[in-house]
């Protein structure tokens, strides 16, 4: 009996040394995980702040075919909205084609939902004819809707899925663009 | 009436450089932002970079390091100045303004030619 008590706590024992044999395996195996965690932490970090110096658009700003588009955080009259742009080496954002202006208030939907953003069109105050900030009139299908009654200046916002007018004094957020840079490979 | 005027533009090899000058007149230059533009043929009219009323600088990536803008508030003059000027920096360069209240402005643009 004496004998076989004996037996089992050895073997018992034994299973506690190879629990704690497990153990110290599992903590070493995590520590070696913690490390490699870390070291591909500090690649991936590595990669992508050597991918940022080459990336075709500066951080917070998004890309669509060649060009850059940031969205503001803040909002300003349309003066200012241009001068922030001019800041950043861009313009007010200028709208080419429908295809880009649906890739706006797609992106726009996507990121802050339905609010007014300047864009880079403004009303000739002697003529009445619209102008892009490069001086170009606009395409015949991306003429703001008629919504300012005010007799003062008025530039183009851009607001879901229409393009409208509104007092170039009035505050609201608004979009640059720029082109993306050209991958020198 | 807002007027602007460009001058300095030239023939110039690569490599060399180049000032711009734009004159305005009828605004009250100190508060309006400028802005340099260029044209190449067949091309869209492209910002090359600009000045705040507080003047804060931008620049396109193409011309980053060796395009510089200034201003002289007192002389109602906006510069661009071009060094190290290459072959695809061939172009009209315009200057634009827009005032406070929304009015843009455009110079009639001076021809930039750099040859190789």
């Known amino acids: 009996k004496l004998l076989q008590v004996s037996t089992i706590a050895m073997q018992q024992q034994e299973k506690l040394i190879q629990q704690e044999r497990a153990l110290l395996n599992f903590t070493e195996w995590k520590r070696s995980c913690a490390l490699q965690m870390k070291y591909c932490q500090a690649f991936m970090q590595n990669s992508l702040s050597s991918a940022h110096n080459s990336s075709p658009c500066p951080n917070n700003w998004i890309q669509n075919r060649e060009s850059c588009y940031y969205v503001s955080e803040i909002w300003s009259i349309w003066h200012t909205s241009q001068e922030n742009c001019l800041k950043e080496g861009s313009t007010l954002l200028q709208i080419e084609s429908k295809e880009e202006m649906d890739f706006i208030t797609g992106s726009l939907r996507k990121i802050k939902g339905s609010y007014d953003y300047w864009v880079g069109l403004s009303q000739d105050g002697h003529s009445g004819r619209w102008l892009w900030q490069d001086g170009s009139s606009p395409s015949p299908g991306l003429l703001p809707a008629e919504r300012s009654q005010s007799a003062n200046q008025v530039c183009g916002y851009v607001k879901s899925n229409s393009l409208l007018s509104s007092n170039c004094s009035t505050w609201k957020y608004f979009i640059c663009e720029k082109y993306a840079l050209r991958s020198s490979v | 009436q807002v007027q602007l005027q460009e001058s300095g533009g030239g023939l110039v090899q690569a490599g060399g450089s180049l000032r711009l000058s734009c004159a305005a007149s009828?605004?009250?230059?100190?508060?309006?932002?400028m802005a340099w533009y260029r044209q190449a043929p067949g091309k869209r009219r492209e910002l090359v970079g600009g000045?705040?009323?507080?003047?804060?600088?931008g620049y396109a990536d193409s011309v980053k390091g060796r395009f510089t803008i200034s201003r002289d508030n007192a002389k109602n003059t906006a510069y661009l100045q071009m060094n190290s000027l290459k072959p695809e920096d061939t172009a009209v360069y315009y200057c634009?303004?827009?005032?406070?209240?929304?009015?843009?402005?455009w110079g009639q643009g001076t021809q930039v030619t750099v040859s190789s």
């Open positions: 634009g303004t827009s005032t406070p209240r929304g009015d843009s402005y």
């Open positions: 009828g605004t009250l230059f100190s508060i309006n932002g």
């Open positions: 000045i705040t009323s507080d003047g804060s600088t």
